[in-house]
C-alpha cells in the first residue's frame, strides 16, 4: 500500500507568493510559493495519485503583515480551503498567547491540530479541551493512518504560551500516544511536529512504532540529487534514521516559507512496515500557475492589508540582508540598521557629560525574519518592515552589568553554526569571537561605545560597570535562552513598538544605506 505525504512547515504567513529569498514578491514572473500556487500543485497530486495526505508541521503563524492584521484567521481560512489533513502546533502558534491560538485557529480549523507533549492545566484545561489533540486517526483510501503531534519543549522560551500549558519532553510524551495507537490496531504512524531536525531524528530513533517523521522548526532543507534553487541540502530526502529497534525511519522537512512542497512516497507492507520511501521537495516556482479561485480569495483578503501598510516610508539604495543565512552567522546590514534605529529612537541628550544616555544595542539574529530587496525602486513600506520584524514586540531599555553582557555574548555563539536565533547583531559594540575555543570562552574582545564622552569611541567592557542597553523585549524576558538577561537585569523599561522604531528612523533618514562594517569579527 502506497501513501503520498505532502508536507509544509514554517510557512510563516507567506500566503502570497514571494521572491526566491521568501521576501515580498517583486517580479511576479520569478516568484514562488503562496497558497494559490500550493493549492494548484496539491490538487494536481490529489488528482493523479490515490492515497494523499497534506500535513503541516507548525509555524503557520507570524512572519508578514497577513498575521499582523488577521492574527491567525487567515491561517484557518486558507488551510481549510486547501483541505489540510492535519497540523502540528509550532512555537509561533502561541505568539499572541493562548487566546490568540484558540479563537482564530483552534476553533475555526476544519482539520485536526495536534500536539502530544502540550498539557493544559488549571482553568485553561477545560477551555482548550478537545480543541487540539495528541493524535488523530485518519482514513486514507481503504486504510487508516495515525498522526501524532509534537511541539518544541522550548516554546515557553520562544513564545507566549502562558503559565497554564506544560511542554513536556517530546519523546517521553510521544511514546504512550503511539502505544495507544498500536492498541487501536493502527499500524501506520506518522509523527508530525515542530521541534527541529535534531529532535526529529531522535524521535525516529527512540519512539517505538513511529514509521515516518515529518518535522519543522529548523527550516531544514533536505534533497536527493541536484537542488533546484539556492537552498543547500542538509542531507538526503528522506533522511533515513535507524531506530533503536532496527527499523529504517524516514525523516523529512521542507525548508520554510511555502517555497517547497514536501513530497514523500511511502510503501507499506500489509503489517504496516515501511518497505520503501522516496521523494523530494517540489519547488513551487512560477511554472506552476496560481489557482484562480484561491488567488481571487487572497486578493479579497488583501484589500484590508493594502489600506494598512502600503505607504512608502523611505528608500534604501542597498540590499537589506535580513536572511537567516547571514543574520544568524555574521554581522548583517539589516541588523546594523535596526540597531542604529533603536539607538536613534533613544537619543536623549541629558547633560554636557554624556552625548547620550545609551549607546549600545543587542538584537537576536533570529528576530530578523526577512530581507528587503532594493530593486523595488528602493521603496520601504510598513509591510516590508512587518516581514522583517513580524512579532509585534517592543525595543526596551535595560540596565545590565558588564559581566551579564559578557555572558550574553558567550551565549550568542555557544552553539554557533546551527542557524539558531541567539546569534547577536549589535550597535555600539565591537565583538571578536574565537570559535576554536570551547563554548563559554569564545569572546576574545568586547569593546563598547562610551556614553560619557564628547567624541564617542570604543573602550573595553568592564565586568563590574553598569551599562544601559537597548534590546527587544523578547531578550529582556529571557527569550532565545538569554536567561542571564532576565535573571540579572537591574532595570527594565518598556519601549516603543519595534516596527515603529525602524519605520520612524527610515522616515527620518529618507534614504538609507547600511553597511557591514566590522562590528562583529571572528579571529
Amino acid at each position: 500500500w502506497e501513501l503520498t505525504i505532502l508536507h509544509t512547515n514554517d510557512v510563516h504567513s507567506r500566503l502570497e507568493q514571494t521572491s526566491e529569498d521568501s521576501s515580498k514578491c517583486v517580479n511576479a514572473s520569478r516568484c514562488m510559493g503562496g497558497v494559490a500556487r500550493l493549492f494548484t500543485k496539491v490538487q494536481q497530486i490529489r488528482r493523479a495519485e490515490p492515497n494523499v495526505l497534506l500535513l503541516d508541521a507548525g509555524d503557520q503563524y507570524q512572519g508578514t503583515i497577513w498575521f499582523t492584521v488577521y492574527k491567525g484567521a487567515e491561517v484557518a481560512h486558507f488551510m481549510n480551503a486547501l483541505r489540510y489533513d492535519a497540523m502540528a502546533l509550532g512555537n509561533h502558534e502561541f505568539d499572541n498567547g493562548v487566546e490568540g491560538l484558540i479563537e482564530p485557529l483552534l476553533k475555526e480549523a476544519k482539520f485536526p491540530i495536534l500536539s502530544a507533549n502540550i498539557k493544559a492545566k488549571g482553568p485553561l484545561a477545560s477551555q482548550i479541551s478537545g480543541l487540539y489533540l495528541p493524535y488523530k486517526v485518519l482514513p486514507v483510501g481503504d486504510e487508516v493512518v495515525g498522526i501524532v503531534g509534537y511541539t518544541s519543549k522550548e516554546t515557553p522560551f520562544l513564545s507566549n504560551p502562558g503559565t497554564n500549558l506544560v511542554f513536556e519532553d517530546e519523546i517521553t510524551a510521544l511514546q504512550p500516544e503511539v502505544d495507544k495507537l498500536k492498541t487501536l490496531n493502527v499500524n501506520k504512524i506518522i509523527a508530525l511536529g515542530h521541534s527541529g531536525f535534531e529532535t526529529d531524528k531522535l524521535i525516529a530513533q527512540k519512539v517505538r512504532g513511529v514509521d515516518v517523521v515529518v518535522g519543522g522548526h529548523s527550516n531544514t532543507f533536505l534533497y536527493t540529487g541536484n537542488p533546484p534553487s539556492k537552498e543547500v541540502p542538509a542531507g538526503k530526502y528522506p533522511f533515513i534514521v535507524t531506530s533503536d529497534d532496527g527499523r529504517k525511519v524516514p525523516v523529512v522537512q521542507a525548508y520554510a516559507f511555502g517555497k517547497y512542497l514536501g513530497y514523500l512516497k511511502i510503501e507499506f507492507d500489509e503489517r504496516g512496515n515501511v518497505i520503501s520511501s522516496h521523494g523530494n521537495p517540489i519547488l513551487l516556482n512560477s511554472s506552476i500557475p496560481e489557482d484562480p479561485s484561491i488567488k481571487a480569495d487572497i486578493n479579497k483578503w488583501r484589500i484590508k492589508l493594502d489600506n494598512y501598510s502600503t505607504q512608502e516610508l523611505g528608500k534604501t539604495i542597498v540590499y537589506l540582508d535580513g536572511s537567516s543565512q547571514s543574520c544568524r552567522f555574521r554581522e548583517c546590514n539589516m541588523g546594523n540598521l535596526i540597531c542604529d534605529a533603536m539607538i536613534n529612537n533613544n537619543l536623549r541628550h541629558a547633560d554636557e557629560m554624556f552625548w547620550n544616555h545609551v549607546s549600545m544595542c543587542i538584537l537576536n539574529g533570529g528576530g530578523i525574519r526577512s530581507p528587503i530587496d532594493e530593486r523595488n525602486n528602493g521603496t520601504i513600506t510598513w509591510e516590508n518592515l512587518a516581514a522583517v520584524l513580524p512579532f509585534g514586540g517592543t525595543f526596551d531599555l535595560v540596565q545590565l552589568k558588564g559581566s551579564t553582557l559578557k555572558k550574553a555574548f558567550e551565549h550568542s555563539v555557544h552553539r554557533y553554526g546551527q542557524s539558531t536565533g541567539e546569534f547577536l547583531q549589535v550597535g555600539g559594540i565591537h565583538v571578536v569571537y574565537d570559535l576554536s575555543r570551547k563554548p563559554g570562552d569564545r569572546v576574545v574582545k568586547l569593546d563598547v561605545l562610551c556614553t560619557k564622552c564628547r567624541v564617542p569611541s570604543y573602550d573595553p567592557l568592564k565586568m563590574d560597570e553598569i551599562y544601559k542597553v537597548i534590546l527587544p523585549n523578547f531578550l529582556a524576558n529571557g527569550g532565545d535562552g538569554f536567561q542571564m538577561i532576565k535573571d540579572e537585569l537591574l532595570r527594565h523599561d518598556s519601549g516603543d513598538q519595534d516596527i515603529n522604531v525602524v519605520s520612524t528612523y527610515i522616515s527620518k533618514m529618507k534614504v538609507i544605506y547600511p553597511a557591514v562594517e566590522g562590528r562583529i569579527k571572528f579571529s
Partner: antibody, heavy 123, light 113 residues
Amino acid sequence: EVKLVESGGGLVQPGGSLRLSCAASGFTFTDYYMSWVRQPPGKALEWLGFIRNKADGSTTEYSASVKGRFTISRDNSQSILYLQMNALRPEDSATYYCTRSPIYFDNWYFDVWGTGTTVTVSS
Amino acid sequence: DIVMSQSPSSLAVSVGEKVTMTCKSSQSLLYSNNQKNYLAWYQQKPGQSPKLLIYWASTRESGVPDRFTGSGSGTDFTLTLSSVKAEDLAVYYCQQYYSYPFTFGSGTKLEIK
C-alpha cells in the same frame, strides 16, 4: 531542432538486464518531464513511467507492470535519460520510446517522441 | 487504473471521406478545477514513431492539419478527420493523462480503400 535518440536495445535472455539511453538535444532538458513508452510488436502503446523535472525533484513514477524491475534516471549535465531494465521477461519484448512532456504545468501528454530502440527478450 | 477503450478497432474509408473514431475512459477525465479534459490523440504511421495530434481533448498541436478535430468531454471523446487523405493511413491512439499510470487505448487502424 528538438530531438530524442534512443540506444542500447538488443537481444537479452530472460532474467537478464539492459540499460537503454536517450540522448536529448535542442531543448533545456532539466525543465521537462521525460517518460518511457513501449510498444510490443503489432500491439498498443504502454506508458512505463516518468521522471519529473528538476523543479519537481526529479522523482519517478512507474506503471505496475515494471515497478521494482525498471528504473528511470536522468543525467541533466549530459541531457541523457536512462531506463535500467532488470529481471527481463519475454513479455518485455517491444520497441521502447523515449518521450518528452511539454514544459507547461500539468501537460502530461507526449509532444516529442524518439525513433525507438528494439528490445528482444528470448532464450 | 483508468481503462481507455477505442472503437472501431479498424476502419477503411476512401480518400475525401469524413471519418470518426471514438475513445471512452472508465472514469471522467474532466478536472473540475480547470474544466479541462486530460486526453490526447496520437497518430502512428507504419514503421514510424507516434506523433501528437490533439491534447486537452480538442487543442490541435502546432503543424497538425485542421482536418483533424478532437471533441468530447468527461468519458466520451471523438477524433474526426473531415476529409481523409492517403497520408492519413495510420493507427490512432488516445491517451489519458489525468492520473497515474497514464494509459493508452488499443488504437484504431485507419485504412484507405
